[in-house]
């Protein structure tokens, strides 16, 4: 069954945590649907964003942070492992120095920590996708 | 009650026709939700687009056409009559020489015809909105 989109869930992250998302683009890549995953510092959607991950399917991925309301330097990648019309599995792992983003089991993007992952309180998944799975796995202490 | 998004409906347009849309952005303007309305030449979403109207809420509006699979010259407007968090009513009227876009009863954008409006066979409304009304009024012959 489908999860609501935008999908919002409280989350606490630290080194070893992994966020897993399964979904499908709602339009063909010609029409440039988007997927966005935002790691927020508060439960409010207007809060700062520790890690912003936005896919324009078929074109590019941008990653950034929003600090005290201001977007910082954008990191862009043309790597496009997503397949037109196909379901994807996205996993974002918190490493000691960076986020590692896997697409369908393949390491596809990295983003160095700008803000501590421990500052994350909420994850939001939204834009032009249907969502079938969202999970945060916590490292056993 | 809410209409599904993306929302697709068969439509025939000509001078005097008006497409009316009521909806609400799914996110605060700080997060830059989008609204897109596309007038297609076929019932398929990959078909050409006679009139492409895309709002990046709080930032800008772009209008364009997609002809034989290629995007043409984009028209951009910074006019932003949409209100953060508020419902909007959008009406797109087919005039003899152009489309006239009204937002909450106020004339806000125009786009000169590049392709005959009679070429339109389908309208799609999508991206980051909830949709409560979609209507095409046909000119009585």
């Amino acid at each position: 069954s489908l999860l609501p989109v935008p999908y919002t869930e409280a989350a606490s992250l630290s080194t070893g945590s992994t966020v897993t998302i399964k979904g499908r683009p709602l339009a063909c890549f010609l029409n440039e649907p988007y997927l966005q995953v935002d790691f927020h510092t508060e439960m409010k959607e207007e809060s700062d964003i520790v890690f912003h991950f936005q896919v324009c399917f078929g074109r590019r991925v941008v990653m950034n942070s929003r600090e005290y309301g201001a977007w910082k330097q954008q990191v862009e990648s043309k790597n496009m492992p997503f397949q037109d019309g196909q379901e994807f599995e996205l996993s974002i792992s918190v490493l000691p120095d960076k986020y590692q983003v896997m697409v369908n089991g393949q390491s596809s993007y990295t983003f160095d920590h700008r803000i501590k992952p421990e500052a994350v309180k909420m994850v939001q998944v939204w834009r032009d996708i249907s969502l079938t799975k969202f999970n945060v796995s916590y490292l056993k202490r | 009650s809410l209409l599904p998004v993306p929302y697709t409906e068969a439509a025939s347009l000509s001078t005097g026709s008006t497409v009316t849309i009521k909806g609400r952005p799914l996110a605060c303007f700080l997060n830059e939700p989008y609204l897109q309305v596309d007038f297609h030449t076929e019932m398929k979403e990959e078909s050409d687009i006679v009139f492409h109207f895309q709002v990046c809420f709080g930032r800008r509006v772009v209008m364009n056409s997609r002809e034989y699979g290629a995007w043409k010259q984009q028209v951009e407007s910074k006019n932003m009559p949409f209100q953060d968090g508020q419902e909007f009513e959008l009406s797109i009227s087919v005039l003899p020489d152009k489309y006239q876009v009204m937002v909450n009863g106020q004339s806000s954008y125009t786009f000169d015809h590049r392709i005959k409006p009679e070429a339109v066979k389908m309208v799609q409304v999508w991206r980051d909105i909830s949709l409560t009304k979609f209507n095409v009024s046909y000119l009585k012959r």
Partner: antibody, heavy 122, light 107 residues
């Protein structure tokens, strides 16, 4: 092993522009994810961050010095440079270049040059 | 004036534990780094990402942070640890600030 060496005129007149260059050996300044910073230290005082340039060429400056600061790079010579305009005697300091992994706020600055003293005086 | 506040001086007996604090940062959000500097020399990174030690830095150096205070701890201070110590953090991820420095004396 990455080496850095600052070079610049030891004496600059007030109101002129101070220029210092850092030559990097043992690794390209365009190699990700490193960034390259300028820090200064007035005699007998603490450290002050001036700005940095990322491996992609993006620049970031201290708000207090931004209006007078420009950091650029010469990739062919593997150098990056600092220009500080409209100097006063308060700009007298040892100027250091340093390397950091990605953003210096996250990883700190792990390799420093020896520093070059620039005196502003007429 | 610095956005990060350090005590100007700290004394420790040889072999004892020294703690140098750094206050005023948003350490719940931004990492802190620590440097040591001896007269006439360039600073040397001793701690990054709050508590990580670069290779070659002795294990007696450790770091921690909580709220608006970060702490550099030197367990079993040695004579060669006598130096100036600076904390460094971010006002944002692209705006760096240093503390005013702490002179550590090993008695």
């Amino acid at each position: 092993q990455v080496q850095r060496q600052e070079s610049g005129p030891g004496l600059v007149k007030p109101s002129q522009t101070l220029s210092v260059t850092c030559t990097v050996s043992g690794g390209s300044i365009t190699t990700g994810p490193y960034s390259w910073s300028w820090i200064r230290q007035p005699p007998g005082k603490g450290l002050e961050w001036i700005g940095y340039i990322g491996y992609s060429g993006s620049t970031y400056y201290s708000p207090s010095l931004k209006s007078r600061t420009s950091i650029s790079r010469d990739t062919s010579n593997n150098q990056f440079s600092l220009q500080l305009s409209s100097v006063t005697p308060e700009d007298t300091a040892v100027y250091y270049c340093a390397r950091s992994r990605s953003s210096p706020t996250t990883f700190g600055m792990d390799y420093w040059g020896k520093g070059t003293l620039v005196t502003v005086s007429s | 004036s610095s956005a990060l506040t350090q005590p100007s001086a700290v004394s420790v007996s040889l072999g004892q534990t020294a703690r140098i604090t750094c206050q005023g940062g948003d350490f719940g959000r931004y990492y802190v780094a620590w440097y040591t500097q001896k007269p006439g020399q360039a600073p040397v990174l001793v701690i990054y990402q709050d508590s990580e030690r670069p290779s070659g830095i002795p294990e007696r150096f450790s770091g921690s942070s909580s709220g608006d205070t970060a702490t550099l701890t030197i367990s079993g201070a040695q004579a060669e640890d006598e130096a100036e110590y600076y904390c460094q953090s971010g006002i944002s991820s692209d705006n760096i600030v240093f503390g005013g420095g702490t002179h550590l004396t090993v008695l």
